[in-house]
């Protein structure tokens, strides 16, 4: 049975380590839902397309989210 079909959350471990926004390919924020009761943040890295679950409560990750949203607001018209 593929795990993804039987489990509703995605993150097995979460990383508290800072992530350089420049090394990010993509940042997904999955809100809590009936399927998974917690917010999950999944960073896709440019290097080899590695995906890493980040700790939404970590100060470093909160700073990353601020930096990314700031960058996005700069880009949007």
């Amino acid at each position: 049975v593929p795990l993804s079909r039987t489990v509703r959350c995605t993150c097995i471990s979460i990383s508290n380590q800072p992530v350089n926004p420049r090394s990010l390919e993509k940042l997904e924020i999955i809100p809590a839902s009936q399927f998974c009761p917690r917010v999950e943040i999944i960073a896709t890295m440019k290097k080899k397309g590695e995906k890493r679950c980040l700790n939404p409560e970590s100060k470093a990750i909160k700073n990353l989210l601020k930096a990314v949203s700031k960058e996005m607001s700069k880009r949007s018209p």
């Epitope: 593929p2 795990l3 993804s4 039987t6 489990v7 959350c9 993150c11 471990s13 890493r52 679950c53």
Partner: antibody, heavy 124, light 108 residues
Framework: QVQLVESGGGVVQPGRSLRLSCAAS????????MHWVRQAPGKGLEWVAV????????YYADSVKGRFTISRDNSKNTLYLQMNSLRAEDTAVYYC?????????????????WGQGTTVTVSS | EIVLTQSPGTLSLSPGERATLSCRAS???????LAWYQQKPGQAPRLLIY???SRATGIPGRFSGSGSGTDFTLTISRLEPEDFAVYYC?????????FGQGTKLEIK
Amino acid sequence: QVQLVESGGGVVQPGRSLRLSCAASGFTFSSYGMHWVRQAPGKGLEWVAVIWFEGSIKYYADSVKGRFTISRDNSKNTLYLQMNSLRAEDTAVYYCAREGAGSSLYYYYGMDVWGQGTTVTVSS
Amino acid sequence: EIVLTQSPGTLSLSPGERATLSCRASQSVSSGHLAWYQQKPGQAPRLLIYGASSRATGIPGRFSGSGSGTDFTLTISRLEPEDFAVYYCQQYGSSPYTFGQGTKLEIK
């Protein structure tokens, strides 16, 4: 330093129970998925069970399903394996191991920290 | 369950030689879900490679992993005396996690 220390092993009769513990130190235990892996004498590695970082999701090998229960106490930085209805074939060294930081269903970072193991012998 | 078959069972080589260890899966495994471990007698396993080809922290550059789908390889470019051990591949593409039966790398 990052460390995992197993305890609770010993000699037990078939059908009896045993509880293994794994004390974690040197890292934020509550952020990591944790595993039990065993190794019978002279044999290879066999994965036993996994518990996700916050403790709500657990998986077991078919060989132990319904007999073994993995659990954790994040306030005590401790992982447990409750083993019931033990059989001779459960005789092994039991290792606890940490799932790599940020592992998910999409990408697996391996078991990056292991304890030294605790020996369980099931014999009459 | 996905069965991993490692070959050869035993590999006899001399220090300085190149070692190539194979791991074949009974079903396709995402490369992001394949790891390699080293185990020496009386010791716990040590993570070498994750994601099929990424070296774990502190692992020397002579160790490299490659492959995708059902065929994966661990290569040790130039054997050092401390590399003689048992090597296991392991998958996490589907539950349960499974290990290969191991390849023993011994001194010729």
